[in-house]
Interface confidence: low
């Protein structure tokens, strides 16, 4: 129903803690280079007005959209062109235009520092200090990290590191309690970050309807017993919390997906029984539980999907009637049967039967025409199985490091004119996939392998479509979502490319690596390794393995050393003449 | 490198049966699905049966209920089973593995239906 003040309808329904949370994400997404304090004041001005509102629906300026708000908010900070360049642009334009110029502008690989974690006594002291503020840090950092975070997620996510410090602060040994658990947050927040980038990028690029199809094929995989007029309702719904978190509208995404959750758990007969344990928690831990529960049990009854989809005389005419219908039928059929499959595999093969419906309804005798479009899915089906299969088997005989940097040679050769720290960060990310995944039982490791390296490719295309350098990435990056893993999956090596002349300097190392953390170290062997790869970009597996492992050889003695620096003076160049060797 | 050897096919009349059979060699056979096809002079290859790694099968819609498709990972063979056989069933069949990752098909063995 339509509100007096859209600001105080918000501010009702989320309470003050939630609206005060989503409005500093937003803000922080909004403009990525502005302090906490400044967004602090921000928001504070924003909610003391919201307050106004709720006093008095008629008050001055209560009857205006959020994005006039927000809008006329952010465009009255001090220095905005010196600071944000262009995008104070944005700020001549009029609603809805405006909006709009702010989402185009927000930066995926904004430069700022990566987010350092204080050490525990510093952390708990100042978390006891101001519990409030502290926990503000945490959503503006994160957020203006990661510009399309989903909010309420996010707000979930608050909530657990909030916990965490409450309970390990309280601890003698603060630092052996809060690490692992921060770790498991970060590592959970990273990947629900890339998942919901993909999701806007489908949004943005391919339109509500692609979105809602990605929707249909995970719903109907997690609730095979629910209908497909059920399953259309929960898609549509959730499509539209999406859209509007990937436009910045965060007051309405968190309210219409609380709305959503609370729909669910009213509903649990028709949708699934493995709601209740999620239904019991408070809303921020039901709404996420419920995004990731497991799959209910399939019905033992399902009919061969052939059936409807083949083997009935009127499939041309359901299809012509109806065609998305039909295809949505399809993909929820097909999917409740398959919770073993990937989202990106089930459109695939949605989209399989769509071009082979438009074809062959053309034809004189369609039936046999149609007829072999499930033995047609196979080689689309096999694909990736065996892709899951070759690096599961990789990963378990490498371990995660060395798999990253198989992942890292193969990239390198594969698109050798992206960026050394992109590719690296690719690299790692992708290599990830085998902790995540390939430890899972059998039907649980492709959905998992694959969905989770689309998110992880989307992410190189965001980055490679700020400066194209590789007409292979150019290429993936170009075609739908669902095919681009495949895509990059069958690049080979870039015949193009012209390889990189040998630098001494990028292989010149200085004792102060010795004292970084691991994951630095590995990050500045892995930039090493690409940098080879670009030199030689037909180099063999055992020629870079000669040269990592004696890389990695000179590190721990140099690193041993009494004296140090002279051991990396003298040894390093040693190093860079065997290098040359090896490669030669 | 990888090979395929097709064998079974020959001359038999209508409503009459054979056993084809095809051994893989040169690539890890149980974790593809295999494919058997059917050439006619002057047409397109076309998918008779498929079977997955894990031995689920699919069918063509003239081969439905009449044709079995079934395999062995320890002797890396596929089989085809074909019953009650019509002159349109006629054509080299061949099988090969259902994979992008490399393209590769046999020989072919020749049935003709026949009266």
């Known amino acids: 129903e339509a509100h007096k003040s859209e600001i105080a309808h918000r501010y009702n329904d989320l309470g003050e803690q939630h609206f005060k949370g989503l409005v500093l994400i937003a803000f922080s997404q909004y403009l990525q280079k502005c302090s906490y304090d400044e967004h602090a004041k921000l928001v504070q001005e924003v909610t003391d007005f919201a307050k106004t509102c709720v006093a008095d629906e008629s008050a001055a300026n209560c009857d205006k959209s959020l994005h006039t708000l927000f809008g006329d908010k952010l465009c009255a900070i001090p220095n905005l062109r010196e600071n944000y360049g262009e995008l104070a642009d944005c700020c001549t334009k009029q609603e809805p235009e405006r909006n709009e110029c702010f989402l185009q502008h927000k930066d995926d690989n904004p430069s700022l520092p990566p987010f350092e974690r204080p050490e525990a006594e510093a952390m708990c002291t100042s978390f006891k200090e101001n519990p409030t503020t502290f926990m503000g840090h945490y959503l503006h950092e994160v957020a203006r990290r990661h510009p399309y975070f989903y909010a309420p997620e996010l707000l979930y996510y608050a909530e657990q590191y909030n916990e965490i410090l409450t309970q390990c602060c309280a601890e003698a040994d603060k630092e052996s309690c809060l690490t692992p658990k921060l770790d498991g947050v970060k590592e959970k927040a990273l990947v629900s970050s890339v998942r919901q980038r993909m999701k806007c990028s489908s949004m943005q690029k391919f339109g509500e309807r692609a979105f809602k199809a990605w929707a249909v094929a995970r719903l109907s995989q997690t609730f095979p017993n629910a209908d497909f007029a059920e399953i259309t309702k929960l898609a549509t719904d959730l499509t539209k919390v999406n859209k509007e978190c990937c436009h910045g509208d965060l007051l309405e995404c968190a309210d219409d997906r609380a709305e959503l959750a609370k729909y669910m758990c009213e509903n649990q007969a028709t949708i699934s029984s493995k709601l209740q344990t999620c239904c019991d928690k408070p809303l921020l831990k039901k709404a996420h539980c419920l995004s990731e529960v497991e799959h209910d049990t399939m019905p033992a009854d399902l009919p061969a999907i052939a059936a409807d989809f083949v083997e009935d005389q009127e499939v041309c005419k359901n299809y012509a009637e109806a065609k998305d219908v039909f295809l949505g039928t399809f993909l929820y059929e097909y999917s409740r049967r398959h919770p073993d499959y990937s989202v990106s595999l089930l459109l695939r093969l949605a989209k399989k039967y769509e071009a082979t419906l438009e074809k062959c309804c053309a034809e004189a005798n369609p039936p046999a025409c149609y007829g072999t479009v499930l033995a047609e899915f196979q080689p689309l089906v096999e694909e990736p199985k065996n892709l899951v299969k070759t690096n599961c088997d990789l990963y378990e005989k490498l371990g995660e490091y060395g798999f990253q940097n198989a992942i890292l040679v193969r990239y390198t050769q594969k698109a050798p004119q992206v960026s050394t720290p992109t590719l690296v960060e690719a690299a790692r990310n992708l290599g990830r996939v085998g902790t995540k995944c390939c430890t899972l039982p059998e039907d649980q490791r492709l959905p998992c392998v694959e969905d989770y390296l689309s998110a992880i490719l989307n992410r190189v295309c965001l980055l490679h479509e700020k400066t194209p350098v590789s007409e292979h990435v150019t290429k993936c990056c170009s075609g739908s979502l669902v095919e681009r893993r495949p895509c990059f999956s069958a690049l080979t090596v870039d015949e193009t490319y012209v390889p990189k002349e040998f630098k001494a300097e990028t292989f010149t190392f200085h004792s102060d690596i010795c004292t970084l953390p691991e994951k630095e170290k590995q990050i500045k062997k892995q930039t090493a390794l690409a940098e080879l790869v670009k030199h030689k970009p037909k180099a063999t597996a055992e020629q870079l393995k000669t040269v990592m492992d004696d890389f990695a050889q000179f590190l721990d003695t140099c690193c041993k050393a009494a004296d140090k620096d002279t051991c990396f003076s003298t040894e390093g160049p040693n190093l860079v003449t065997r290098c040359k060797d090896a490669l030669a | 490198q990888v090979q395929l050897q097709e064998s079974g096919g020959g001359l038999v009349q209508p409503g009459g049966s054979l056993r084809l059979s095809c051994k893989a060699s040169?690539?890890?056979?149980?974790?593809?699905?295999m494919g058997w096809y059917r050439q006619v002079p002057g047409k397109e290859r076309e998918a008779v049966a498929t079977i997955s790694s894990g031995g689920s099968p699919f069918y063509a819609n003239s081969a439905s209920g009449r044709f079995t498709i079934s395999r062995d990972n320890a002797k890396s063979t596929v089989y085809l089973q074909m019953n009650n056989l019509k002159p349109e069933d006629t054509g080299v069949y061949s099988c090969s593995p259902i994979t992008s990752i490399f393209k590769a098909q046999g020989q072919g063995t020749q049935v003709t239906v026949s009266s």
């Open positions: 040169g690539f890890t056979f149980s974790i593809y699905s």
